[in-house]
């Protein structure tokens, strides 16, 4: 299944022609441009920049580009009144106030309009009380500190670092332990790399640097004033006592120096373990409360925030499909930046520009792909997937009907070790074979592919001889295309080694700091490993429009489903006397995995033998293989979470940038030995059992034979 | 290669003042916390004081504060010790040393390069 | 002030010996020691930081262990070149302090 047999083909146009044709000067070029001012969602510097794009795209040959705006709820800090947290004495006088601001780097003291750290949709309050540190605020955090520890975080301002999970769920298991306020700090342990010098001189983590993010819980919903609904002109909006997924407790991130003033007057418990203790010069004591001396002082925090409904902004581009125009691969990330954006999203938009640019000079050559390309660049990722998720709503009966594939292209890199890669197990194969045919930009790995540096530095745990490929978690775009419409979906980026360097995401992430030069200097001088990025993801853009028969391989899905499931029991036979009490059986779903296997196998081997010249059976092949995503969307939904549909796939319910596998069961199961009504808890992990089994049975019966 | 060059000892007396440099070469001398280090004679070591990259932060062991002074001149990879109000028990040899952070942006986890020594005599 | 002391204050030991000092803190400072190595007339040399790590250039037969406040600084087969006085030091708080130091003597 050869990409050269497009519509108007001359032998030039093939993969390699586009492949060629992207140059890491441009993207470099294209990253400055990006860079110099901050681009905030819902500010004019986001709109001028969303115009500009569609200008450019225009330029570079798409058939038609177009802004489609939402009006959102943002958040935003009072400019007037700036958020902080002090520590009081006993008179209630402020003796420590956390920074107002990041000190800017070279180069950018002039800049205006750079956002202060903030936790976006924080309400505004002023709690004041006795600090508990939490470690980074997990699930399993919060058990060791009431179950075994009995310390009661009710009425408590906690301290959390950042890491590990997503921090809107740090905050909502702080707001279900009863805290009043939270505080997040980014740890040297988890944002300084060891033996490196901090930004200017390096790419750590300043002490006085700061990460910004949201904080919702959203589950998937999008707006949180319409859930399920594009937020356009006539839409219906929620009060913000109804709003989706807000916090309800004031929240507030610091940077390690103002941590360290917080936390080295600690007093309570000793840290349980070494776990609980970061790289700081303190003594991570639990609390409640400060030590001896300090005991009669207290935190306050001040939050001024407030929450807007405010316009933003997506750019649109279209590159209609010559053969089968109807059928959607859409390449999106998102524009929007905390600041400068130099990695997060930037890095990823030039890439976006640069394979807009070389797909604009095969179409003016005479090329077309055979399927459409949507190109689309998101505002409002860091408010909660906004941009993206609104689209989607608006147009979900096209994309649930036409949508063969959705490429995500956030940041580039964090990191410049090897690639990493996070797909629908329908896209493994295309991605194997794509990075074969690839080189690899690693030193040491000169004239080799890319697949096999890959390979070598992040084998996969289960096939030797393969790379890692991760499940799909969420905190992205593609989660509203493959979590709540079963769009197939991918990304990739260059990261770090995760063996070697154990801290959360790149140092300077949602920083001041993350800056043009910072990629220019120190990830990325040559801009290869962003050339690299930009091949991967444009080549799989390439191959899903313009591939005869789409690059998806079922059986694939199969041996991941056997996996998943396998796992899911070896979880629930940890409690046998349970099972044998309430009858759990897993029969029905090993039955369902067992019968997709075997279906997939023999639908795979029609694949190869089916007349491909005939039209009608070809698109219906291929509409099977687009339809087998979709068949494992469960309509109702997962369990108080109707936004994420998707059976085998789901962010984890304690941290939304992992991905989980058979979700429904897995979160019937967790902590099922607390449960107050045993019976009540097996009997949903029954019901979820019944759900997994036919909706694998289902997906399986999509590939059957029609007739 | 890295480098710290130290001078402006001597001998001084009692409630006199002197003022020692330490000049950096082969590091980027602004991205890095510095101090000074002293050892009496026939004794151990003794931290003086520090002084953090951008001169914001300073530092001091008791018995010198009030009398001596840590600054530096970034633009002249140049660290200085002032010293007033000498006693006797000020007599030591002083090492300017910079300090690593190895593992965050701190006032420092060591002490990984030394100058050669500088020796300061207070007596009448 | 966290006070700092070591033992033995001297140590006569042979080539070839393997060769323990002892450091303990006064109070807790966790994994924030350094080991020193001074010769008469030199400045000091960084051998050992954050109790454990080996400072780049640093033989392999030295090694650092410890945490909380009790701390050891080992020398695995002593070279002629090590006879020397050897310093630890807290970073975990301002002020830094010494320990007043151990001289490695030849037996």
């Known amino acids: 299944k050869s990409s050269n047999e497009a519509t108007n083909i001359t032998p030039k146009h093939n993969m390699k022609a586009f492949l060629d044709e992207l140059k890491a000067e441009n993207i470099k070029k294209f990253l400055y441009n990006f860079t110099q001012i901050p681009h905030l969602a819902g500010t004019e510097q986001n709109f001028q920049l969303a115009k500009q794009i569609q200008s450019q795209w225009k330029e570079f040959g798409l058939d038609s580009v177009e802004l489609a705006h939402y009006d959102v709820l943002l958040s935003y800090p009072n400019k007037t009144h700036p958020n902080y947290i002090s520590i009081i004495n006993e008179d209630g006088n402020e003796i420590f106030n956390t920074s107002l601001f990041e000190p800017p780097p070279p180069g950018y003291e002039n800049v205006s309009d750079i956002v202060p750290p903030f936790s976006a949709f924080s309400p505004q309050g002023m709690p004041e009380g006795d600090l508990v540190y939490v470690n980074y605020a997990r699930t399993e955090d919060f058990f060791k500190l009431e179950r075994d520890m009995k310390i009661n975080c009710s009425g408590k301002i906690v301290i959390a670092r950042y890491g590990k999970v997503f921090r809107g769920n740090k905050v909502k298991n702080a707001q279900l332990a009863g805290a009043k306020g939270v505080i997040l700090y980014s740890d040297p342990a988890d944002y300084f790399a060891p033996g490196v010098k901090s930004y200017p001189d390096g790419w750590n983590l300043p002490g006085g640097g700061v990460q910004r993010g949201n904080i919702l819980n959203l589950n998937g919903a999008g707006d949180p004033l319409t859930p399920g609904y594009p937020a356009n002109e006539y839409a219906y909006r929620r009060g913000i006592a109804e709003a989706v997924g807000l916090p309800s407790i004031p929240v507030h991130p610091i940077g390690y120096y103002d941590a360290q003033k917080l936390l080295e007057k600690m007093g309570g418990s000793a840290p349980p373990d070494s776990s609980w203790r970061g790289s700081l010069k303190v003594p991570y004591n639990v609390g409640p409360g400060f030590t001896g001396n300090f005991s009669t002082q207290k935190v306050k925090m001040h939050i001024h925030s407030t929450n807007e409904v405010t316009r933003i902004y997506n750019v649109i581009g279209t590159l209609r499909g010559a053969v089968e125009p109807d059928r959607y691969v859409i390449l999106g990330g998102h524009r929007d930046s905390w600041v400068f954006g130099g990695i997060d999203p930037q890095s990823g938009a030039a890439v976006v520009h640069e394979i807009v640019r070389s797909f604009g000079t095969l179409k003016k050559e005479g090329w077309r792909p055979r399927r459409t390309i949507l190109f689309a660049s998101w505002d409002a990722e860091e408010f909660g997937l906004l941009g993206s998720t609104e689209w989607a709503e608006e147009n979900s009966r096209l994309l649930q009907e036409r949508g063969v594939a959705y490429i995500n292209a956030d940041s580039s890199i964090e990191g410049n070790y090897t690639l990493r890669v996070d797909c629908t197990p329908l896209m493994y194969s295309l991605v194997h074979n794509l990075t074969k045919e690839l080189k690899s930009p690693d030193e040491g790995f000169e004239g080799k592919s890319l697949y096999e540096s890959w390979t070598k530095k992040s084998p996969s745990p289960e096939f030797s001889g393969m790379p890692r490929i991760s499940k799909l978690g969420s905190g992205n775009d593609f989660e509203v295309f493959f979590q709540r419409l079963g769009i197939a979906s991918g990304r990739a980026r260059y990261t770090k080694n995760w063996e070697t360097n154990k801290f959360s995401g790149y140092p300077l992430y949602h920083s001041v700091y993350e800056t043009y030069e910072l990629v220019e200097k120190f990830y990325d001088p040559m801009f290869k490993y962003h050339l690299t990025v930009a091949q991967v993801r444009g080549g799989m853009v390439f191959e899903l429009a313009n591939s005869i028969v789409l690059p998806f391989d079922c059986r694939d899905y199969a041996v991941v489903l056997r996996k998943y499931a396998d796992k899911i029991y070896s979880i629930s036979m940890k409690h046998p006397q349970e099972m044998k009490t309430y009858s759990v059986s897993f029969d029905s779903l090993f039955s369902a995995v067992k019968n997709f296997t075997e279906i997939a196998s023999k639908f795979s081997e029609r694949l190869q033998d089916f007349d491909k010249s005939n039209p009608i059976v070809l698109r219906m092949m291929n509409d099977q293989l687009m339809f087998l995503e979709r068949a494992f969307i469960d309509p109702l939904g997962l369990p108080d979470r109707p936004f994420y549909r998707h059976v085998i796939y789901a962010p984890s319910s304690h941290n939304k940038y992992a991905g989980e596998s058979f979700p429904g069961i897995y979160d019937a199961l967790f902590d099922i030995e607390s449960k107050v009504d045993p019976s009540k808890a097996w009997g949903e992990v029954k019901r979820q059992i019944y759900v997994a089994a036919f909706t694998v049975q289902a997906a399986a019966e999509t590939l059957s034979e029609v007739a | 290669q890295v480098q710290l060059v130290q001078s402006g000892g001597g001998l001084v007396q009692p409630g006199g003042s002197l003022r020692l440099s330490c000049a950096a070469s082969?590091?980027?001398?602004?991205?890095?916390?510095m101090s000074w280090v002293r050892q009496a004679p026939g004794k151990g070591l003794e931290w003086v004081a520090n002084?953090?990259?951008?001169?914001?932060?300073?530092y001091y062991v008791d018995s010198v504060k009030g009398r001596f002074t840590i600054s530096r001149d970034n633009a002249k990879n140049s660290l200085y010790l002032q010293m007033n109000s000498l006693r006797a028990e000020d007599t030591a040899v002083y090492y300017c040393?910079?300090?690593?952070?190895?593992?965050?942006?701190?006032?420092?986890?060591?002490?990984?390069?030394w100058g050669q020594g500088t020796m300061v005599t207070v007596s009448s | 002030a966290i006070r700092m002391t070591q033992s033995p204050s001297t140590l006569s030991a042979s080539v070839g010996d393997r060769v323990t000092i002892t450091c303990r803190a006064s109070?807790?400072?966790?994994?924030?020691l350094a080991w020193y190595q001074q010769k008469p007339g030199k400045a000091p040399e960084l051998l050992i930081y954050?109790?454990?790590s080996l400072q780049s250039g640093v033989p392999s037969r030295f090694s650092g262990s410890g945490s909380g406040t009790d701390f050891t600084l080992t020398i695995n087969s002593l070279q002629p070149e090590d006879f020397a006085t050897y310093y630890c030091?807290?970073?975990?708080?301002?002020?830094?302090?010494f320990g007043p130091g151990t001289k490695v003597d030849i037996k």
């Open positions: 082969g590091f980027t001398f602004s991205s890095y916390w």
């Open positions: 002084i953090k990259q951008d001169g914001s932060e300073k």
């Open positions: 954050a109790a454990s």
């Open positions: 040393a910079r300090v690593w952070d190895y593992y965050y942006d701190s006032s420092g986890d060591a002490f990984d390069i």
């Open positions: 030091q807290q970073s975990y708080t301002i002020p830094f302090t």
């Open positions: 109070q807790n400072i966790y994994g924030w």
